[in-house]
């Protein structure tokens, strides 16, 4: 599990159609 102090920071991954975008790229979400 993530440490408590990390919980408000996003995790970033490559994906397609993520982060309200139609193409492929990096997407960071909490």
């Amino acid at each position: 599990r993530r440490r408590r102090r990390d919980t408000h920071f996003p995790i970033c991954i490559f994906c397609c159609g993520c982060c309200h975008r139609s193409k492929c790229g990096m997407c960071c979400k909490t």
Epitope: C16, K23, C24, G25, C27
Partner: antibody, heavy 121, light 106 residues
């Protein structure tokens, strides 16, 4: 103003280690992903590694995986690149670069001036 | 993955320069473009295919569809002479730069 300043480069023998630093100023360092990108003499740009907001969320190019380690100290506004088992082909100018702000940080919007690493016997 | 750029492009002052960046399904991912002058660090000129960072002149524009992204410089000026690199993500561990294009303003 927004600035990235690399240091720690130099001449090192094959198989040895070196640690690069990148001091950030003028922005909230912890709010940005940070990259290392290198450029061999007379050649193009090559991505090396990225570390995102959480220190455990990091990725490496295949060419350096297992030899290089990217890390950050948000309290010191500093990015690091620990380079072990150096090879002649690692000779390059090493740039630190800031990832764009926001949910979709595809591009590198701020670059440092670079620090030269020469691996030679 | 590879992104292929022409090694060099020449243009007369005031004319339009187009620099291409070709790669497998390039149009399905976001392209960024960087300008690098001799002895200097790269500068971001286009991101997310078509967007210009603040401070970048309007003469710089971009497009991306099919297998090719294109950087267009309209009304090219002498100060635009530089190397230009495209860049795209292919996975979380695979950021790819093109080989670079040397733009010469004749």
């Amino acid at each position: 103003q927004v600035q990235l300043v690399e240091s720690g480069g130099g001449v090192v023998q094959p198989g040895r280690s070196l640690r690069l630093s990148c001091a950030a100023s003028g922005f909230t360092f912890s709010n940005y992903g940070m990259h290392w990108v290198r450029q061999a003499p007379g050649k193009g740009l090559e991505w090396v590694a990225v570390i995102w907001y959480v220190g455990s969320n990091k990725y490496y190019a295949d060419s350096v995986k297992g030899r290089f380690t990217i890390s950050r100290d948000n309290s010191k506004n500093t990015l690091y690149l620990q380079m072990n088992s150096l090879r002649a082909e690692d000779t390059a100018v090493y740039y630190c670069a800031r990832a764009q702000e926001g949910m979709a940080p595809d591009a590198f919007d701020i670059w440092g001036q670079g620090t030269m690493v020469t691996v030679s016997s | 993955y590879e992104l292929t750029q022409p090694p060099s492009v020449s243009v007369s002052p005031g004319q339009t320069a187009s620099i291409t960046c070709s790669g497998d399904k390039m149009g399905e991912r976001y392209a960024s473009w960087y300008q690098q002058k001799p002895g200097q660090s790269p500068i971001l000129v286009i991101y997310q295919d078509t967007k210009r960072p603040s401070g970048i002149p309007e003469r710089f524009s971009g497009s991306n569809s099919g297998n090719t992204a294109t950087l267009t410089i309209s009304g090219t000026q002498a100060m635009d002479e530089a190397d230009y690199y495209c860049q795209a993500w292919y996975s979380s561990t695979n950021v790819v730069f093109g080989g670079g294009t040397k733009l010469t303003v004749l």
